[in-house]
Amino acid sequence: WELTILHTNDVHSRLEQTSEDSSKCVNASRCMGGVARLFTKVQQIRRAEPNVLLLDAGDQYQGTIWFTVYKGAEVAHFMNALRYDAMALGNHEFDNGVEGLIEPLLKEAKFPILSANIKAKGPLASQISGLYLPYKVLPVGDEVVGIVGYTSKETPFLSNPGTNLVFEDEITALQPEVDKLKTLNVNKIIALGHSGFEMDKLIAQKVRGVDVVVGGHSNTFLYTGNPPSKEVPAGKYPFIVTSDDGRKVPVVQAYAFGKYLGYLKIEFDERGNVISSHGNPILLNSSIPEDPSIKADINKWRIKLDNYSTQELGKTIVYLDGSSQSCRFRECNMGNLICDAMINNNLRHTDEMFWNHVSMCILNGGGIRSPIDERNNGTITWENLAAVLPFGGTFDLVQLKGSTLKKAFEHSVHRYGQSTGEFLQVGGIHVVYDLSRKPGDRVVKLDVLCTKCRVPSYDPLKMDEVYKVILPNFLANGGDGFQMIKDELLRHDSGDQDINVVSTYISKMKVIYPAVEGRIK
């Protein structure tokens, strides 16, 4: 019996088509992805093949102005329109709190939303009961398939799930649910979830009875043969894991941002064994036309976004200096504002011993593309912020050793004075440079804000200590020559859309007046 699994993950609000790098579509003839194009391909496959499932492995939320404005209603609407069969909860589904998940998505979705390792307690338990499920048995043709969901247990550090949701270990939580499916005579089981490729592989290895793993969170691109675009494969598609009980379990992911549609064909025997698995992600490029009815719907929803862009988010009473003459040479108050917003967006009081789990921010000065003049009645709009941060990036959470941070700050000024983008703006860090010294030895003082303290204060950086840092995804991926970050990072979790982080902070503060205050000397 042959099953076709179509899958997406980490779409992050890319409802409209995008450029090849998943930023705003500029030249339509070269654009990719988007739900209208996705629908065309899904329908084409549904017409051609008998047993098809369309699955999403989480993180539909967060990433563009679509989410900022519609807050998840757009996800429910368009996923319903595409007739998704199931979705797993990702960490970003909790970005607007549990209410921001329940109302727009859980109550509106016409498909099951799954996670076996999230357990509700207290007053939330009854409120959320039945709105998401540990598993769902879906009829597919003459057969039934069990889908069991999972979500990163790091979600409390990455999002805002509140205190009434417990995130359990994925493997521990999945096994009893899979066992339950087996007792219900369901012998074809897909684990669909959002914990990253390493955990996907562990689930394939350790959870008895899981036949296929469809994952997300790590934006992993897998491909067999010559890849069709710029993404470099992390392995073959599907990636085959040998389970502890001797079965070959295919593991798949489909990069991110709706650029690809994962396409996996599985042949099962009567016992539910995977006899064969093959496929590849399908690049959703302009050779696939956008479905006209979905496209018309997108254009209708788009109107509200254009109006939102010009509305006031808050006010500044000082000039926000985002000029390259400042931000690539010295501490600039736009850099301070952005870093303060980045830390504020990551306030998570999950442990009494820590005032917060992260206190540090670094930001490449070259990523700040425009100032904001306060003489326009102090008004700040989304449009203004889009000029400052035009690349559609995210502000991510990484774990780095102190020694890696030291290398990063040396790189920050290794060719100082040439107006290059690698000069770092900071938050929760005090750095002193001596530019008379030779490159690679210019950082003379590097103090960082403590986290395991009730009164935050600055302590010298320890080379062997592991620190959490918020930074742009551009830097996490080694951009502007920060190869040491990419090579040496110990953990990387993608965060919220850059503009959204700053806009939320400005809306919260109402009036801002960031200063230059001696963070960089």
Partner: antibody, heavy 114, light 107 residues
């Protein structure tokens, strides 16, 4: 649990036909196909062909084409294999086996003798 | 038709021995190979499917490996109940074909 139950032993004369049945249970019968395999005394296994229950599609090994017919009765989840123009070398145990031979019938002994 | 050449045709081994049986296909069959066990008296049982996946209930001392045209069944430590005849089966293309079998006997 998958179970395949075959009909009893047959003794046939050369030139006659034999029809062996295989009743399946414990799985979604219509979603899969069934194989027929035979084993002559003291010999190895020989694949004869397969039938896809839902559509009645068949694929026969060239060696048996024109002599073998596989049919299905979906109402009783039963597959049949008929072999005609029997000769002595068709004396064998005939097995039905699920789509990728994960489960086997108990075998039906067919003896062709004058 | 794809020919499956299985070797050895028979072997004698003692309890606890490591036993290896090989199947060579006349052309590339990908991963489309099963290993079957037939006990005296006729009962057939699949041990390995898709080259290396172990059927449920089959002891972990059985393992399969290989690719392209060369495939192997290994019994890491032969047990009394393992004395039987073993067959490989390719299902990469029609007609499916079996190896000639390997009879594993007590030394």
């Amino acid at each position: 649990e998958v179970q395949l139950v075959q009909s009893g032993a047959e003794v046939k004369k050369p030139g006659a036909s034999v029809k062996v049945s295989c009743k399946a249970s414990g799985y979604t019968f219509t979603a899969y196909f069934m194989n027929w395999v035979r084993q002559a005394p003291g010999q190895g296994l020989e694949w004869m062909g397969r039938i896809y229950h839902n559509l009645g599609d068949t694929f026969y090994s060239q060696k048996f084409k024109g002599r073998v017919t596989m049919t299905v009765d979906k109402s009783t989840s039963t597959v049949y294999m008929e072999l005609s123009s029997l000769r002595s070398e068709d004396t064998a145990v005939y097995y039905c086996a699920t789509s990728y031979v994960g489960d086997w019938g108990q075998g039906t002994t067919v003896t062709v003798s004058s | 038709d794809i020919q499956m050449t299985q070797s050895p045709s028979s072997l004698s081994a003692s309890v606890g021995d490591r036993v290896t049986i090989t199947c060579r296909a006349s052309q590339d069959i990908g991963d489309s190979l099963n290993w079957l066990q037939q006990k005296p008296g006729g009962a057939l049982k699949r041990l390995i499917y898709a080259t290396s996946s172990l059927d449920s209930g089959v002891p972990s001392r059985f393992s399969g490996s290989g690719s392209g045209t060369e495939y192997t069944l290994t019994i890491s430590s032969l047990q009394p109940e393992d004395f039987a005849t073993y067959y490989c089966l390719q299902y990469a293309s029609f007609p499916w074909t079996f190896g000639g079998g390997t009879k594993v006997e007590i030394k």
